[in-house]
């Protein structure tokens, strides 16, 4: 059993049928020595007297919020949540496995720029009772800062018969140094509670393996006088890394016909420009990766060519 | 060639080699996401490796102020991969294919440090720890850490030759 | 075509050493390595070690605490294996095998004994 | 040292019918999470052995009704539809921690 925080307990269980489960003793946060009484949530049956409560903790049953009693009047509370361990793994029944890049991720992060600040979203199936709290530092061992924001519910979605949950999280490092190679991985936690079943996720991750630059603003078109080409031309994300000479990206441009069975020639360049040839109906697309580090390409940016 | 005593280095041909370097970097190793490093062990085998870090001068700021900090850590460096990658870990079991992309980064490294390597001047260079596994898993597996380790050095060494092409540049 | 061809069979004393050659072609000797299995009358096989001449790395299985010496010699293409100390448990077909020991990008740890020796029977008896 | 355990140790089957070998190594003989250091070789009585399936992939010249799975320590070699020339002792064999070491071998024989 740890305390979480002040007047919440987690017990860990190991989950089997006929488990013994975890003895627990309780004690009462007062200086009253007589007259105690226990109960347990709403219920008003009296558990146990005297400043102590020892109890077994076997089942979700036995969690919940256990109140210290005098002459009727509520003196301190312990709440009881429990983390499960099955076959020596702790339980992931809160969040959905997203299966990306790997399987077990509950967590996917990702950056926009090398400024210290990432955004961390997860999915579940749960829309009550459900709250979470996140923790983030660079390293683990001698942890330096990182600030994080508030949980939001970000998305909502259908997903056949289920409604699916996306929450996210902001969070800045403190002392951020973008033009370094980082050394040591940011590790951010995920403390979830669903009704009295407590689960933590943990990511770990350098920023530069999770950038994912905005999509090329600004696309433009202008034909070239008596040809079929164009010349395009598009611009940095406003949101990425200055100086561009330092943090510079490369890019990649294709033109897609109607048809999505059409043939796309990809070109690859570092410029912001290139000469294209853009058929009627067709669109020119646009994407941005990090020059010199194979990260995430960002989303594509289209233009039509008409 | 480059940089005596404390005058520039070829920026543009550094630039070219360094943005090489890159691509073969990757090329060596590119299977990053399918693997999960952490699995064999979490001790950090690459933990002495050079890291270029925040008070080397290699932000853009540092560079115009004085680039030779920052020069010296990327040549460290690269002396320090290029060892490594000469080493029993690379030279061992389970053997690289003679057309390797390690065989050309190894090359591409040396050649890069020589271009900053300052005429009659030798800078000094860390020690290189020669850790040979005694499992050939444990020789692949401190590849891909050093591999991966390099991805991050060559990444900021090609931006520091990018900015001083682009605006150290006589 | 690739080949490897082992010395004959040897009747040793308990206490001597008996050193088995086995002789590559067909192949470049030092892109490859050699290894030797040994398996004893109606038993299985049990690995000995390998030799790579390339990077000059030798293998042992610790089992034989310094009783086994696995060399090369590159200007003959050909392998040997010298076990010393010997007893009558070491009654077996000894056996060279090629091994290809590979990293690429498609296959990180890639190993294949793919060409075996005919085997060499030692029997060692008093 | 890893330990490799082979079951049955030896196995009569129906020509035409399926054949399954296993083997249990004492610890895990995959390399980050995805490489299995596990292999499985063929001996016919007089012969050496012969390699058939290679870290999940079937040896080229091996017929495709022998096929591997398994992952971590649990492996499995599996013959389709069992031919008369696929009377042998199977072995397997890990390299992932020197010493490599094969299993006890299983003899597969027509019933």
């Known amino acids: 059993i740890w305390e979480l925080k002040k007047d919440v307990y987690v017990v860990e269980l190991d989950w089997y049928p006929d488990a013994p489960g975890e003895m627990v003793v309780l004690t009462c946060d007062t200086p009253e020595e007589d007259g105690i009484t226990w109960t347990l949530d709403q219920s008003g049956e009296v558990l146990g007297s005297g400043k102590t409560l020892t109890i077994q903790v076997k089942e979700f049953g036995d969690a919940g919020q256990y109140t210290c009693h005098k002459g009727g009047e509520a003196l301190s509370h312990s709440l009881l949540l429990l983390h499960k361990k099955e076959d020596g793994i702790w339980s992931t029944d809160v969040l959905k496995d997203q299966k990306e890049p790997k399987n077990k991720t509950f967590l996917r992060c990702e950056a926009k720029n090398y400024s210290g600040r990432f955004t961390c979203w997860w999915l579940t199936t749960i829309s009550t009772d459900l709250t979470f709290s996140v923790k983030s530092s660079r390293g683990s061992s001698n942890p330096q800062g990182v600030t994080c924001g508030a949980v939001t519910l970000s998305a909502e979605r259908v997903r056949g018969d289920n409604k699916e949950y996306e929450y996210s999280v902001e969070c800045q490092e403190d002392s951020a140094c973008p033009a370094a190679e980082e050394r040591l991985p940011i590790e951010v936690m995920v403390d979830a509670i669903h009704k009295l079943k407590y689960e933590n996720y943990t990511s770990s991750f350098f920023i530069r393996d999770i950038i994912k630059p905005d999509p090329p603003k600004n696309l433009q078109l202008k034909p070239l006088k008596n040809s079929r080409q164009v010349e395009v031309s598009w611009e940095y994300p406003d949101t990425w890394s200055t100086p561009h000479s330092y943090f510079s990206l490369t890019f990649c441009i294709q033109v897609q016909g109607k048809s999505k069975r059409e043939k796309k020639d990809r070109i690859f360049t570092d410029k912001t420009s290139a000469t294209v040839i853009c058929r009627k109906n067709a669109s020119f697309s646009v994407q941005a990766q990090d020059r010199y580090y194979s990260s995430s390409w960002s989303e594509w940016a289209s233009v039509p060519c008409s | 060639r480059a940089v005596p005593g404390g005058s520039s280095p070829a920026w543009a041909q550094c630039q070219q080699l360094s943005q090489k370097l890159c691509t073969l970097a990757w090329s060596a190793h590119p299977l990053v996401g399918h693997m999960d490093l952490r699995e064999e062990g979490d001790e950090e085998t690459t933990n002495d490796v050079p890291h270029i870090q925040c008070g080397d001068g290699c932000d853009p700021q540092g560079l115009r102020d004085n680039s030779q900090f920052c020069l010296q850590r990327i040549r460290q460096g690269l002396i320090f991969y290029e060892k490594l990658l000469g080493s029993d870990i690379f030279t061992g079991e389970p053997s690289l294919l003679p057309d390797s992309p390690v065989g050309q980064l190894h090359a591409s490294l040396l050649g890069l440090s020589q271009l900053l390597q300052p005429e009659g001047h030798h800078w000094e260079t860390q020690q290189i720890p020669s850790p040979s596994p005694s499992q050939p898993w444990q020789r692949l597996l401190l590849r891909f850490k050093i591999l991966r380790s390099l991805q991050a050095f060559v990444a900021v060494a090609a931006r520091v030759f990018a900015h001083g092409a682009a605006t150290l540049s006589p | 075509q690739v080949q490897l061809v082992q010395s004959g069979a040897e009747v040793k004393k308990p206490g001597s050493s008996v050193k088995v050659s086995c002789k590559a072609s067909?192949?470049?000797?030092?892109?490859?390595?050699i290894t030797w299995v040994r398996q004893a009358p109606g038993q299985g096989l049990e690995w000995m070690g390998e030799n790579y001449p390339r990077s000059g790395n030798t293998y042992y299985n610790e089992k034989f605490k310094g009783r086994v010496t696995i060399t090369a010699d590159k200007s003959t293409s050909t392998a040997y294996m010298e076990l010393s100390s010997l007893r009558s448990e070491d009654t077996a077909v000894y056996y060279c095998a090629r091994v290809e020991f590979i990293s690429t990008v498609v296959a990180p740890y890639y190993y294949a004994l793919d060409y075996w020796g005919q085997g060499t029977l030692v029997t060692v008896s008093s | 040292d890893i330990v490799m355990t082979q079951s049955p140790d030896s196995l009569a089957v129906s020509l035409g019918e399926r054949a399954t070998i296993n083997c249990k190594a004492s610890?895990?003989?995959?390399?980050?999470?995805?490489?299995?250091?596990l292999h499985w070789y063929q001996q016919k009585p007089g012969q050496p052995p012969k390699l058939i399936y290679n870290?999940?992939k079937l040896e080229s010249g091996v017929p495709d009704r022998f096929s591997g799975s398994g992952s971590g320590t649990d492996f499995t070699l599996t013959i389709s539809s069992l031919q008369a020339e696929d009377v042998a002792v199977y072995y397997c064999l890990q390299n992932k921690e020197v010493p490599y070491t094969f299993g006890g071998g299983t003899k597969v024989e027509i019933k």
């Open positions: 870290l999940a």
């Open positions: 610890k895990k003989v995959t390399i980050f999470g995805s490489i299995s250091a």
């Open positions: 067909g192949y470049t000797f030092t892109s490859y390595g």
